[in-house]
Amino acid sequence: APFDDDDKIVGGYNCEENSVPYQVSLNSGYHFCGGSLINEQWVVSAGHCYKSRIQVRLGEHNIEVLEGNEQFINAAKIIRHPQYDRKTLNNDIMLIKLSSRAVINARVSTISLPTAPPATGTKCLISGWGNTASSGADYPDELQCLDAPVLSQAKCEASYPGKITSNMFCVGFLEGGKDSCQGDSGGPVVCNGQLQGVVSWGDGCAQKNKPGVYTKVYNYVKWIKNTIAANS
């Protein structure tokens, strides 16, 4: 049976205000995905979050209230990975160039790209404004946080036989109850101060033996750097 023992992310908690300063909301009249600010003019998100028009919202905590720290910047370029596969969600990563530079401050700042792949057991922070109910709909206004460990590739593949590529990894709890969910896509998985993952997919949310699946950012560092250089 689905877990419904908490009402955050699923099973997380209210982030302290602006404590995740690299977290962005992608908006098309409503929040549809998250993202991560990696430099003053570029955001990393999921390839499946592609839309032709995106407004990037930085400095957000409560996405339904103007709190005074927000920066709303339209996307100038939206570049999905050339090998993105909609059917398998392999290469599920996208870069967004902002139409103007973000103003970096205590509430809006960048997150580092990884220098090594994610290690099994590492505790990471997942954040987003996604559904907080594992069944039904309960979308929060305030940013939700979840602390969760990187799972071994063997456990990840056992959870999703034949579906996990080398560009994916699992984070979460095999017992269920804590997970990212709909609306969290594209958002960050940060481990030891580095952006290791992008929220991608999963079988439901917070289900037993069905952890969240995330894009392995480490595999795309070269593509990210080359793409930014070619579009600056």
Epitope: G136, A137, V199
Partner: antibody, heavy 125, light 107 residues
């Protein structure tokens, strides 16, 4: 501009089948989904089903399961809706409508922003 | 299935009037609701999406509000071209469901 253009009116006998087409233009067909909605004379709107243009994943209204098939042809940016074993109460205007694709853990939102002009299907003996 | 109940089923109003239409979902749908306008012989037209976002090209006299189970469409000053039937639609989950419609007629 973004538009959906549907095939012309059809008159069918009970027990027959009908296949309505919906040709998309002005946007990347595979970045969106298509819903089919029908409206019987003087009645409200009834959702029939949904198809992802990129994967052909479908979700059909329970009352039409087994009688309806939705398909897409990405080479021509066209969606199709076939309804079999037609009955008189299938007489309606049939609409296709564009909606956001829903993938992975993005927000699932099933609104419809662009509609076809409608195809009248009359079932009569 | 999520049932959508619209009220009133019809309303008579004059040009310049403020008109309010309500829609209630049988279970919570967060902000995932759309409003459409339909004129006789025409396809529905999207007015409001995600409960309160105004679709591009739609006049600002149309507004939407609500979250959870209760939603409202407001026309602040009714114009002659606004006489039509209005439908709400829950956009949260399959099966997609519509309200029964509200016909706005000339008084």
């Amino acid at each position: 501009q973004v538009q959906l253009v549907q095939s012309g009116a059809e008159v069918k006998k009970p027990g027959a089948s009908v296949k309505v087409s919906c040709k998309a233009s002005g946007y990347t067909f595979t970045d969106y989904a298509i819903s089919w909605v029908r409206q019987a004379p003087g009645q409200g709107l009834e959702w029939m089903g949904w198809i992802s243009a990129s994967t052909a994943d479908t979700n059909y209204a329970q009352k039409l399961q087994g009688r309806v098939t939705m398909t897409t042809d990405t080479s021509t940016s066209t969606a199709y809706m076939e309804l079999r074993s037609l009955r008189s109460d299938d007489t309606a205007v049939y609409y296709c409508a564009r909606g956001d694709e829903v993938v992975g853990k993005m927000t699932y939102y099933y609104g419809m922003d662009v509609w076809g002009q409608g195809t009248t299907v009359t079932v009569s003996s | 299935d999520i049932q959508m109940t619209q009220s009133p089923s019809s309303v008579s109003a004059s040009v310049g009037d403020r008109v309010t239409i309500t829609c209630r979902a049988s279970q919570g749908i967060s902000r995932w609701l759309a409003w459409y306008q339909q004129k006789p012989g025409k396809a529905p037209k999207l007015l409001i999406y995600a409960a309160s976002s105004l679709q591009s090209g739609v006049p600002s006299r149309f507004s939407g509000s609500g979250s959870g189970t209760d939603f409202t469409l407001t026309i602040s000053s009714l114009q002659p071209e606004d006489f039509a039937t209005y439908y709400c639609q829950q956009a949260n989950s399959f099966p997609i469901t519509f309200g029964g419609g509200t016909k706005v007629e000339i008084k």
